[in-house]
Amino acid sequence: CKAMHVAQPAVVLASSRGIASFVCEYASPGKATEVRVTVLRQADSQVTEVCAATYMMGNELTFLDDSICTGTSSGNQVNLTIQGLRAMDTGLYICKVELMYPPPYYLGIGNGTQIYVIDPEPCPDSDF
């Protein structure tokens, strides 16, 4: 009957190529076989979905083909990678975990990871 706790890092710095990775870990109150993981972005109290994937425990995490997210799962831990980030995408990224099956359903929401994205300086034109 316990609530589900979700842990994620407080801060992550995206790479110069606009890629950010972080681990989302959840303490499962039950033996879930089907789990849904959603990444949400919170900006100015507005929340929008970045990507979502449902997976069966023991199987791989599969996002849609056009998703900017990829990930792998291991037990109660999900390794998430968000690609194509730009400076304007800097913000709080929340990991939401739902235990979909078997009953009961559980919802877990992390405190969010602040992802900082710095656009690379353009290379100066070089004369040959």
């Epitope: 009957c1 316990k2 609530a3 589900m4 706790h5 109150p29 089907e34 849904r36 959603t38 949400l40 929340v47 929008t48 979905e49 979502a52 449902t54 929340i94 939401k96 739902e98 979909m100 099956y101 009953p103 009961p104 359903y105 559980y106 919802l107 929401i109």
Partner: antibody, heavy 118, light 108 residues
């Protein structure tokens, strides 16, 4: 704008069936869990059922289990509640509600009245 | 099943006064999954507070939520005429999702 509109309520005899619909607009329907909540006259809110995302996972409150079926058609942006073997105590206003990104029921329909009476 | 109890059942106050509504859970509820709703006669419920303390979009700042564990509070700092209604708490962290019986705030 984001909106939910229920329909299908009415007066029905005990033991009969009724199907409620909830038409959604203004948001990506398939990205949200959808609930039915009811309110008997003069009483509080009672959660009835939920259906998640693609429609594979569904959960019901004990009083309706085995009698009610929740479903959705994501291509039509519509939520349904098939109510069979209706009883007097199913008389209520039935609301559909969206499970928001952070879980709370953030958007509600206006409700549709179901009266079970002989 | 998590049972929610609300008190008082009815709160009779005057406009401008402060309203304090209580919601108690039969077992610990994470504050991330506790909501408050307002319902006026003949209308659908409206989300006021989610995550125990975060105001929903468009909700005035006279509404505030607090609490953790099994005890939660909704406070209306200065009652406006439009605030007289029934208020429900709800837990949405696990199924079955449950509502409290409601507190009616009426005009004294």
């Amino acid at each position: 704008q984001v909106q939910l509109v229920e329909s299908g309520g009415g007066v029905v005899q005990p033991g009969r069936s009724l199907r409620l619909s909830c038409a959604a607009s203004g948001f990506t329907f398939s990205s949200y869990g959808m609930h039915w909540v009811r309110q008997a006259p003069g009483t509080g809110l009672e959660w009835v059922a939920v259906i998640w995302y693609e429609g594979r996972n569904k959960y019901y409150a004990d009083p309706v289990k085995g009698r009610f079926t929740i479903s959705r058609d994501n291509s039509k942006n519509t939520l349904y509640l098939q109510m069979n073997s209706l009883r007097d105590d199913d008389t209520a206003v039935y609301y559909c509600a969206r499970a928001g990104d952070l879980g709370a029921f953030d958007i509600w329909g206006q409700g549709t009245m179901v009266t079970v009476s002989s | 099943e998590i049972v929610l109890t609300q008190s008082p059942g009815t709160l009779s106050l005057s406009p401008g006064e402060r309203a304090t509504l209580s919601c108690r859970a039969s077992q610990s509820v994470s504050s991330s999954y506790l909501a408050w709703y307002q319902q006026k006669p003949g209308q659908a419920p409206r989300l006021l507070i989610y995550g125990a303390s975060s105001r929903a979009t468009g909700i005035p700042d006279r509404f505030s939520g607090s609490g953790s564990g099994t005890d939660f509070t909704l406070t209306i700092s200065r009652l406006e005429p439009e605030d007289f209604a029934v208020y429900y708490c709800q837990q949405y962290g696990r199924s079955p999702f449950t509502f409290g019986p409601g507190t009616k705030v009426d005009i004294k």
